[in-house]
């Protein structure tokens, strides 16, 4: 049987340098993980030891740290070229800086094919982008050939900024004709590489005839066979085996996120290109794997510009930005308002004439706001200032929740009010009134939310059975600060942009800011 080794990454999100175990900034180098220098060491080790190796990325290299803020994708092309990736699928975040922000730094500079079969360009963009990304690519591996077909979340227009000249088709509908085309070209070993999340990965394995392996991303899914080596809890075995509608066993893999692991899958094919065995596991890229010195030196060279950037002025504030715990954990604070306004602004997507925007609401745990910014320093706001406010390297994500879940979240916000705990919610697009004289779990007496399906936004009472879109920190989406109801009851979760980047972009856009405390959160006693 012919053996293929698939090495894969996904949702790296700008983690070019090594990180701490939780994928935030590396503090103690002896315990740090990931980073492209370490990844290269492991990839080279496997390439030397095994004959037929592919290195694939399933999208979302863009967005996540200051590296992307400064280099805007040039860093992705440079270091992926250095690591000699064989192919990449487009993720939703690759469109964060618009189509131009994808074409110039990445599509034109990448020395490897970038793929998506379900993105179709139209209008003037069609000729401009033609050939810069492909539906599929046939790669020679040894003396065999392997077909790689790409796909991207069809939700991308709601999650990023692809503009109006890209159409995102249904993944399965778009993939099947491309796979059929590969079959007519006598390509009998086909990998679907894409960025639509684990549920869609499994559907592709089940429904798309001719796909032998699915390598996915977007949902940050961790799969592992045996005892996992770090903190991540496996969602299933690696590879996850799906029985296709035509009776084949199709391995599906993903490798968590942030470059912490290198996915490692060995596939055996028979003479007809059928998968006769598959096994492997993600490799934890911990400090036992040395960083490659030449890549590390290159990282250090590129790093210099980042240090300069972090002290440059992004914009000015003419008011004190109150990010103190004494305010943000007890009442509406203007830093919370600023951050929530930035979060909504970052998610402006006019995709439907019926809606002024697809999302109007933001919630933010007060405990996530770690510092104020004093306006008496000439009003200057720098990246460094914002990193003190939002030091955890999180993302601002999009979720869908029922009104009843939101009501539970607001009850949780004040269930032990007065103890300076982090779960007190700052808001945007929401008016909430609490009565602290009532017992915990029954303190929300009014909860109005800003309409989206309206030409003039106004506040309406929350409906318990309605499904709402909300922007919030990934920390809350994952149930942090005791918001288990969000984690357990969310109907959809799409990871968003780096928190500091969202706020810095907003401040740069506004140039001068003056957020106020304006009655988003109120307290009453007795009858309301």
């Amino acid at each position: 049987a012919w053996e293929l080794t698939i090495l894969h990454t996904n949702d790296v999100h700008s983690r070019l340098e090594q990180t701490s175990e939780d994928s935030s900034k590396c503090v103690n180098a002896s315990r740090c993980m990931g980073g492209v220098a370490r990844l290269f060491t492991k990839v080279q080790q496997i390439r030397r030891a095994e004959p037929n190796v592919l290195l694939l990325d399933a999208g979302d290299q863009y967005q996540g740290t200051i590296w992307f803020t400064v280099y805007k994708g040039a860093e992705v092309a440079h270091f992926m070229n250095a690591l000699r990736y064989d192919a990449m699928a487009l993720g939703n975040h690759e469109f964060d800086n618009g189509v131009e922000g994808l074409i110039e730094p990445l599509l034109k500079e990448a020395k490897f094919p970038i793929l998506s079969a379900n993105i179709k360009a139209k209008g003037p963009l069609a000729s401009q982008i033609s050939g810069l990304y492909l539906p599929y690519k046939v790669l020679p591996v040894g003396d065999e050939v392997v077909g790689i077909v790409g796909y991207t979340s069809k939700e991308t227009p709601f999650l990023s900024n692809p503009g109006t000249n890209l159409v995102f088709e249904d993944e399965i509908t778009a993939l099947q004709p491309e796979v059929d085309k590969l079959k007519t070209l006598n390509v009998n070993k086909i990998i679907a590489l894409g960025h639509s999340g684990f549920e869609m990965d499994k559907l592709i394995a089940q429904k798309v005839r001719g796909v032998d392996v699915v390598v996915g991303g977007h949902s940050n899914t961790f799969l592992y066979t045996g005892n996992p080596p770090s903190k991540e809890v496996p969602a299933g075995k690696y590879p996850f085996i799906v029985t296709s509608d035509d009776g084949r066993k199709v391995p599906v893999v993903q490798a968590y996120a942030f470059g912490k692991y290198l996915g490692y899958l060995k596939i055996e094919f028979d003479e007809r290109g059928n998968v006769i065995s598959s096994h492997g596991n993600p490799i934890l890229l911990n400090s036992s794997i040395p960083e490659d010195p030449s890549i590390k030196a290159d990282i250090n060279k590129w790093r210099i510009k980042l240090d300069n950037y972090s002290t440059q002025e992004l914009g000015k504030t003419i008011v004190y930005l109150d990010g103190s715990s004494q305010s943000c954990r007890f009442r509406e604070c203007n830093m919370g308002n600023l951050i929530c306004d930035a979060m909504i602004n970052n998610n402006l997507r006019h995709t439907d004439e019926m809606f002024w925007n697809h999302v109007s609401m933001c919630i933010l745990n007060g405990g996530g706001i770690r510092s104020p910014i004093d306006e008496r320093n000439n009003g200057t706001i720098t990246w460094e200032n914002l990193a003190a406010v939002l030091p955890f390297g999180g993302t601002f994500d999009l979720v869908q929740l029922k009104g009843s879940t939101l009501k539970k979240a607001f009850e949780h916000s004040v269930h032990r009010y007065g103890q300076s705990t982090g779960e007190f919610l700052q808001v945007g697009g929401i008016h909430v009134v609490y009565d602290l004289s009532r017992k915990p779990g029954d303190r929300v007496v009014k909860l109005d939310v800003l309409c989206t399906k309206c030409r003039v936004p106004s506040y309406d009472p929350l409906k318990m059975d309605e499904v709402y879109k909300v922007i919030l920190p990934n920390f809350l989406a994952n149930g942090g600060d005791g918001f288990q109801m969000i984690k357990d009851e969310l109907l959809r979760h799409d990871s968003g942009d780096q928190d500091i980047n969202v706020v810095s972009t907003y401040i740069s856009k506004m140039k001068v800011i003056y957020p106020a405390v304006e009655g988003r959160i109120k307290f009453s006693t007795g009858s309301h």
């Epitope: 040894g142 003479e271 065995s277």
Partner: antibody, heavy 112, light 107 residues
Framework: QVQLQQSGPELVKPGASVKISCKAS????????IHWVKQRPGQGLEWIGW????????KYSEKFKDKATLTADTSSSTAYMQLSSLTSEDSAVYFC?????WGQGTTLTVSS | DIQMTQSPSSLSASLGERVSLTCRAS??????LIWLQQEPAGTFKRLIY???SLDSGVPKRFSGSRSGSDYSLTISSLESEDFVDYYC?????????FGGGTKLEIK
């Protein structure tokens, strides 16, 4: 599509040798093992051995290591099995096989 | 060597009936098992590979499964062309070893 085409039936005398061929098409010959299997009526299927054409490496079942010699010609994508010192016990149908497809079988009759 | 014990060695059944053949492996072979069909003319056709994957062009009435070291081939509704010989084959390690075969006969 993958095909393994074997040579025709053989009638040989005891003590002689015979060389059976198996021509492969529809895939890259050098990348996959070719196995040889013996079938005698009422005796089930017996594995003789394999050859990996890419390297010429071979592996034999203990029972057949002095009986069979496996070779391959990569220029013609053909595998061969030579059977020596034939006796009536060697009368059988011999198959070449990959993991996915089998040859049609070659009938060997050893008779004086 | 890994022994493959196939049962039953022969089976009489009627058209439309559901039947199962079993092979037991003497050592762990994982999912590396093939089911073969041998037609009266002597030609072999692979029905199932990797324990449960259906070969292209093979009718969906054939299916393969595993329970521990027991591997089964099930035919959900017998048709006239199914009354032939069946063999299991393990390819986990050399030497390849086969089950003794099952002759499926029409009742």
């Amino acid at each position: 599509q993958v095909q393994l085409q074997q040579s025709g039936p053989e009638l040989v005398k005891p003590g002689a040798s015979v060389k059976i061929s198996c021509k492969a098409s529809g895939y890259i010959f050098t990348n996959y093992y070719i196995h040889w299997v013996k079938q005698r009526p009422g005796q089930g299927l017996e594995w003789i051995g394999w050859i990996f054409p890419g390297s010429g490496n071979t592996k034999y079942s203990e029972k057949f290591k002095d009986k069979a010699t496996l070779t391959a010609d990569t220029s013609s994508s053909t595998a061969y099995m030579q059977l020596s010192s034939l006796t009536s016990e060697d009368s059988a149908v011999y198959f070449c096989a990959g993991l996915s497809d089998w040859g049609q079988g070659t009938t060997l009759t050893v008779s004086s | 060597d890994i022994q493959m014990t196939q049962s039953p060695s022969s089976l009489s059944a009627s058209l439309g009936e559901r039947v199962s053949l079993t092979c037991r492996a003497s050592q762990d072979i994982g999912d590396r098992l093939i089911w073969l069909q041998q037609e009266p003319a002597g030609t072999f056709k692979r029905l199932i590979y990797a324990t449960s994957s259906l070969d292209s062009g093979v009718p969906k009435r054939f299916s393969g499964s595993r329970s521990g070291s027991d591997y089964s081939l099930t035919i959900s509704s017998l048709e006239s062309e199914d009354f032939v010989d069946y063999y299991c084959l393990q390819y986990a390690s050399s030497p390849w070893t086969f089950g003794g075969g099952t002759k499926l006969e029409i009742k």
